[in-house]
């Protein structure tokens, strides 16, 4: 058993049929010595008396808010949560496996630039009685500070018969140099509590590996005389690290119709303009990627050919 | 300890091409190592990230773009002195600070070159003959060093009398390649910045 926060405790249980469970001793936070009784949740049934209560925690029915009273007055609470371990593996029931970039990916993180600010998100099908707490640091043995905000519900989607909820959090490394060469990864830890179930999820990464620039901005087309070619130009996204001559991007320019199966014109360039062939009912799209360290491509920025 | 804006004329910077080749060569070599050593811990997640130039050179700080010198997190206190007579400078106006940056890059390359050559000598003794360093990568390191053209004492190649541990050597190769790729990215950024200035 360990303390998650004040008056909230996590009991780690090996979860298998007829498991013996864990013996837990609760102590009432009071100078009083006698006349103390214990109850669980909203029940008025007295579970025991005295300053300490010993319980055998085996299942979710044994978890919950234990309260010690004296003469009708509440003295203190202890909330017990369960953390299940099945076949030596901690349970991951609360969050959905996003399977990208690999299996068992519950947290996904992205950074728009090298400033040390990043966003992580996760998915769940649970809609109520759910809380998240996020901590982060650079390295684990001698951790350096990363400050994370509160996790918020950022999107709701319908997936077949199920509703899916996306939560996200923004974090900022306390003293980040965009030009630095990272040797210690960022660690992100998410505590998830659903009713009386506790789970924790972690992710470890270098900012350089989670870079995904915003799409290029200000796409403009200029038809070339006596030709089917058009010159398309664009600018670096505002959120990208500066100076751009140091933090350079490379671009992919594509002309395609509405369907992905349609024929296309595609060209890669380090410049902020390119010449392509425009077709009726097609769109010109441009996306960006760090020129020197190949992490993710940005989303497409698009303009119609016409 | 930062790069000034008054740098060589655009397009007159002979090291840009070499640095691009360097990044390409080390990236290819790293990819080859990951594939060949698939049963060794050779991915970014699996290895320890070590920097053999730590406390010996200060390339990131010495080559910091002017725009980032206002960022206190970028200004490390490490001080290292370097020789300052490079040929990539292509202009008499080039400042002492830029020479410091380029000589720091030269020192990095020299250290990695020695490590890689020592390692290759060990890998050539491996009866499995599983992996060797790409000669192209070693050649590209040499080309960039020649383009930088700094005079400095030659570092003797480390020779080892004991029987090499090939498993450890291959793990060290992965560690070295990952670190060198990150440094090659920095070098490419620096050259691009200098070329544009």
């Amino acid at each position: 058993i360990w303390e998650l926060k004040k008056d909230v405790y996590v009991v780690e249980l090996d979860w298998y049929p007829d498991a013996p469970g864990e013996m837990v001793v609760l102590t009432c936070d009071t100078p009083e010595e006698d006349g103390i009784t214990w109850t669980l949740d909203q029940s008025s049934e007295v579970l025991g008396s005295g300053k300490t209560l010993t319980i055998q925690v085996k299942e979710f029915g044994d978890a919950g808010q234990y309260t010690c009273h004296k003469g009708g007055e509440v003295l203190s609470h202890s909330l017990l949560l369960l953390h299940k371990k099945e076949d030596g593996i901690w349970s991951t029931d609360i969050l959905k496996d996003q399977k990208e970039p690999k299996n068992k990916t519950f947290l996904r993180c992205e950074a728009k630039n090298y400033s040390g600010r990043f966003t992580c998100w996760w998915l769940t099908t649970i809609s109520t009685d759910l809380t998240f707490s996020v901590k982060s640091s650079r390295g684990s043995s001698d951790p350096q500070g990363v400050t994370c905000g509160a996790a918020t519900l950022s999107a709701e989607r319908v997936r077949g018969d199920n509703k899916e909820y996306e939560y996200s959090v923004e974090c900022q490394e306390d003293s980040a140099c965009p030009a630095a060469e990272e040797s210690l990864p960022i660690e992100v830890m998410v505590d998830a509590v659903h009713k009386l179930k506790y789970e924790n999820y972690t992710s470890s990464f270098f900012i350089r590996d989670i870079i995904k620039p915003d799409p290029p901005k200000n796409l403009q087309l200029k038809p070339l005389k006596n030709s089917r070619q058009v010159e398309v130009s664009w600018e670096y996204p505002d959120t990208w690290s500066t100076p751009h001559s140091y933090f350079s991007l490379t671009f992919c320019v594509q002309v395609q119709g509405k369907s992905k199966r349609e024929k296309k014109d595609r060209v890669f360039t380090d410049k902020t303009s390119a010449t392509v062939i425009c077709r009726k009912n097609a769109s010109i799209s441009v996306r960006a990627q760090d020129r020197y360290y190949s992490s993710s491509w940005s989303e497409w920025a698009s303009v119609p050919c016409s | 300890r930062n790069l000034p804006v008054a740098t060589p004329d655009p397009g007159m910077f002979p090291c840009l091409h070499h640095s691009q080749n360097l990044l390409r060569a080390v990236s290819n070599m790293l990819q080859k190592a990951r594939q060949t050593l698939e049963f060794y811990p050779c991915t970014s997640e699996e290895i320890d990230h070590e920097d053999i130039t730590k406390d010996k050179t200060s390339t990131v700080e010495a080559c910091l773009p002017l725009e980032l010198t206002k960022n206190e997190s970028c200004l490390n206190s490490r001080e290292t002195s370097f020789i300052t007579n490079g040929s990539c400078l292509a202009s008499r106006k080039t400042s002492f600070m830029m020479a410091l940056c380029l000589s720091s890059i030269y020192e990095d390359l020299k250290m990695y070159q020695v490590e890689f050559k020592t390692m290759n000598a060990k890998l050539l003794m491996d009866p499995k003959r599983q992996i060797f360093l790409d000669q192209n990568m070693l050649a590209v390191i040499d080309e960039l060093m020649q383009a930088l053209n700094f005079n400095s004492e030659t570092v003797p190649q480390k020779s080892s009398l004991e029987e090499p541990d090939f498993y450890k050597t291959k793990i060290k190769l992965c560690i070295l390649l990952h670190a060198f790729r990150i440094r090659a990215v920095t070098i490419d950024r620096v050259m691009s910045y200098l070329n544009a200035s």
């Epitope: 199966r261 024929k263 360039t269 380090d270 062939i277 | -």
Partner: antibody, heavy 118, light 107 residues
């Protein structure tokens, strides 16, 4: 399976014209760009131009501009390349090639040898 | 026009050994570079697109690298069926242009 089948070999006199055909099978004809590339005996490859069969748009290499005409007939899934004012240096194997991507070629015809000789 | 220069023009290789062919562009073409194999009397076959993207059905011993002006096609271990002429082609701008070809021959 996508296939491009070209017309047979031709012998032409200098100053005359030649029209080579390229019939596509497998896949929808208008879903691909169609190019013509030539190869002189023992020489390398030389791009001549492309057509978008969907709308008839064409683009030619400056070297052949005014001398080459590429057309397409959607009803027969056939593309044509006509080269006029032939000279002996036009002796080559003419190949059609296609792709959903405009700028490179993933399926090629077997080639048509055009010999220009007096 | 962008001029593509291949080297060497002839490459004698022992079967089972690796081979590398170089292609240089007269100006920067990013990764707009494709590789083809052509055997005598046959049409070309696409091997690699956009400098390094493998093509379905092409053996994994063929790989490409490079960007800007310098590109390489590598065959990790030459098989008897790999003896052929190899061409690079730039798609950065029209007109599309090819290298003059590299003939890989049995040593």
């Amino acid at each position: 399976q996508v296939q491009l089948v070209q017309s047979g070999a031709e012998v032409k006199k200098p100053g005359s014209s030649v029209k080579v055909s390229c019939k596509a099978s497998g896949g929808t004809f208008s879903d691909y760009y169609l190019h013509w590339v030539r190869q002189a005996p023992g020489q390398g490859l030389e791009w001549m131009g492309w057509i978008d069969p969907e709308n008839g748009d064409t683009e030619y290499a400056p070297k052949f501009q005014g001398r080459v005409t590429i057309t397409a007939d959607e009803s027969t899934s056939t593309a044509y390349m006509e080269l006029s004012s032939l000279r002996s240096e036009d002796t080559a194997v003419y190949m059609c090639a296609r792709n959903k991507e405009l700028r490179y070629f993933d399926v090629w015809g077997q080639g048509t040898l055009v010999t220009v000789s007096s | 026009d962008i001029v593509m220069t291949q080297s060497p023009l002839s490459l004698p290789v022992t079967p089972g050994e690796p081979a590398s062919i170089s292609c240089r562009a007269s100006q920067s073409i990013s990764i707009n570079l494709h590789w083809y194999q052509q055997k005598p009397g046959q049409q070309p076959r696409l091997l690699i697109a956009f400098a390094s993207q493998s093509i379905s059905g092409v053996p994994s011993r063929f790989s490409g690298s490079g960007s800007g002006t310098d590109f390489t096609l590598t065959i990790s271990s030459l098989q008897p069926e790999d003896f052929a002429t190899y061409y690079c082609q730039q798609s950065n701008s029209f007109p599309l242009t090819f290298g003059q070809g590299t003939k890989v021959e049995i040593k």
